[in-house]
Interface confidence: medium
């Protein structure tokens, strides 16, 4: 996504020759290169840049379409409800909004990867901030869902159900506020930076090495480790309680939320492991050499693509794992008069049509 201006060494002419003559990808870089300027050439980025140019635009375009359709469907289903949304459904609606906003920025990054950033510094800051706001929001909202379920099932405390309806909204507002705070560096340090020799402009960070490392640590901790720990803790306790109570219906009801969390972990763990390697190289704990740097750059592109795939995955999970979601989607299509559904007046199998399609509360255990 956003190009990071990592603190490159000064490139010497042996390397420029490789870059200009287009054989940099076959240039032999050992694993034990020193940091000195000229005894070993610093790292060319041609391979990772060419990889990004080929791989990212196609991936981002696909994710943009899938994410927009899927999350649009989720939002439509939730907003078509005649009754008030449950706490989990409210969080899921916010999650759909976060994912939609994130995928809306993908076409911009696709253009940036394919050609250059043509949208100016203002949109660079906004798109970068929007991207990170929604990256953090997705993770934190999943943590909120798991905490809500934890209170509900383990402590039999329906924090949002019995309290004022504003409580869940306030929680969501707090999440968005926190994400805005996390995105401040984007507003400050992101800009459309012109590479004079390549005659290309890219949306990238311009800040010192220490700031870059700090931001990555924040992303790793706040956007991944903390939410994942909260989810793991909450669901471990929930499953323990449900197994002890032999609540098979409850376990079935937990299925979707657990699958969503597992999907989050599977999608984002590879990316954050790569970021961790990068942090360790920044801190000098891992030796930085061209071979490793190039592999990290490519791995970052691939794993971040897998991470962004998570935005499109939630709607699919709801569709395939959530029975109620399928039913409500079907009803919505009927109500909209979908041409190929018009003649069929099929009724959903559940009689509790207004119960939550994701909630694992006393009101609806079979909803998934």
């Amino acid at each position: 996504m956003v190009l990071e201006v990592s603190d490159h060494q000064v490139l010497n002419d042996a390397e420029v020759a490789a870059l200009l003559e287009n054989f940099s990808s076959s240039y032999d870089y050992g694993e034990n290169e020193s940091d000195s300027c000229c005894t070993s050439p610093p790292c060319p980025q041609d391979f990772s840049l060419n990889f990004d140019r080929a791989f990212l635009p196609a991936l981002y375009s696909l994710l943009f379409l899938l994410g927009l359709l899927g999350n649009g469907a989720v939002a439509a289903v939730l907003l078509s409800r005649r009754t008030a949304l449950s706490s989990t459904d409210t969080f899921l609606l916010h999650l759909a909004v976060a994912d939609t906003l994130l995928v809306l920025t993908l076409p911009l990054w696709a253009v940036d990867a394919a050609v250059q950033w043509v949208f100016g510094s203002g949109l660079c800051k906004v798109a970068g901030a929007l991207f990170n706001i929604n990256f953090y929001a997705g993770a934190l909202l999943l943590a909120c869902i798991s905490f809500d379920r934890y209170l509900n099932i383990v402590h039999a405390t329906q924090l949002y159900r019995r309290g004022p309806p504003a409580r869940v909204t306030l929680t969501c507002l707090a999440v968005w506020g926190l994400c805005l705070l996390f995105a401040l560096p984007d507003f400050i340090f992101l800009s459309a930076h012109h590479d004079e020799r390549l005659n290309a402009t890219h949306c990238q960070y311009n800040f010192p090495q220490v700031g870059r490392t700090a931001l990555r640590v924040l992303q790793l901790v706040a956007g991944f480790l903390l939410p994942l720990l909260v989810m793991a803790y909450c669901y471990a306790h929930i499953l323990a309680v449900l197994l002890v109570s032999r609540g098979q219906r409850r376990l079935r009801a937990m299925r979707l939320v657990v699958v969503v969390v597992v999907a989050f972990a599977l999608c984002w763990t590879p990316y954050h492991l790569v970021v961790l390697v990068d942090i360790l190289m920044d801190l000098g704990a891992l030796a930085r050499n061209c071979g490793r740097e190039s592999r990290v750059d490519v791995a970052k592109s691939v794993t971040s693509g897998l991470g962004y795939m998570h935005c499109c995955l939630n709607p699919l999970l709801y569709a395939f794992v959530g029975v109620k979601f399928r039913e409500r989607m079907w009803m919505l299509l009927l109500r909209l008069g979908c041409p190929n559904q018009r003649g069929l007046q099929r009724q959903p199998s559940s009689s509790r049509r207004d119960s939550s399609w994701s909630e694992t509360s006393e009101a609806s255990y079979s909803g998934l």
């Epitope: 490159h8 060494q9 000064v10 042996a14 870059l19 000195s36 800009s191 590479d195």
Partner: antibody, heavy 123, light 106 residues
Framework: EVQLLESGGGLVQPGGSLRLSCAAS????????MSWVRQAPGKGLEWVAT????????YYPDSVKGRFTISRDNAKNTLYLQMNSLRAEDTAMYYC????????????????WGQGTLVTVSS | DIQLTQSPSFLSASVGDRVTITCRAS?????LYWYQQKPGKAPKLWIY???TLASGVPSRFSGSGSGNEYTLTISSLQPEDFATYYC?????????FGQGTKLEIK
């Protein structure tokens, strides 16, 4: 418009110290590697020190290694050269220069230069 | 260290003349860079990557060469071209400059 303004030069005794500054404006200072290049009176140019844009990597020729230290304050858009154990042969006009970017890396040549600050080492 | 030797060190020429300055490297270099310096002024980047003219440099200037020998050529000397020209290499550390060629009006 790219501008580099050196300051801090002057007369100093052999063995003494001096700190040169270079205030940068007109470009994103944090994105560029920077260098100091000197020119003894009536003589040619000599590269003195280079620092990568984030300050992680620094390079020196053997003639100044261990005596000179290049550093930068990106918050202040300022480049520094701390010169210790000065010798008569360090007498020169000291120029601050910017490295251009190519393919995301920093080149060894210089696309913009300041007007220089004169350092005289004499007893 | 790679030594760069410029020849001639001094060159007297007239407006309209074709002038060639040579820069020889003690061992092969990948590219050569040229700077122009006028008295009391800072050097200016003139040619980079051996033959690419820097922004604002007139097309009468050209650069060529490879390996150990490089040249800067002015096809038709103009009054504003009288200055000192330095070559520089960045193939191996330390970055070194030639001693300079002073171009004077005949």
């Amino acid at each position: 418009e790219v501008q580099l303004l050196e300051s801090g030069g002057g007369l100093v005794q052999p063995g003494g110290s001096l700190r040169l500054s270079c205030a940068a404006s007109g470009f994103t200072f944090t994105s560029y590697a920077m260098s100091w290049v000197r020119q003894a009176p009536g003589k040619g140019l000599e590269w003195v020190a280079t620092i990568s844009h984030g300050g992680t990597y620094t390079y020196y020729p053997d003639s100044v290694k261990g005596r000179f230290t290049i550093s930068r304050d990106n918050a202040k858009n300022t480049l520094y050269l701390q010169m210790n154990s000065l010798r008569a042969e360090d007498t020169a006009m000291y120029y601050c220069a910017r490295h251009p970017i190519y393919s995301g890396n920093y080149q060894g040549y210089f696309d913009y230069w300041g007007q220089g600050t004169l350092v005289t080492v004499s007893s | 260290d790679i030594q760069l030797t410029q020849s001639p060190s001094f060159l007297s020429a007239s407006v309209g003349d074709r002038v060639t300055i040579t820069c020889r490297a003690s061992s092969g270099v990948n590219y050569l860079y040229w700077y122009q310096q006028k008295p009391g002024k800072a050097p200016k980047l003139w040619i980079y990557f051996t033959s690419t003219l820097a922004s604002g440099v007139p097309s009468r200037f050209s650069g060529s060469g490879s390996g150990n020998e490089y040249t800067l050529t002015i096809s038709s000397l103009q009054p504003e071209d009288f200055a000192t020209y330095y070559c520089q290499q960045f193939t191996s550390s330390p970055y070194t400059f030639g001693q300079g060629t002073k171009l004077e009006i005949k």
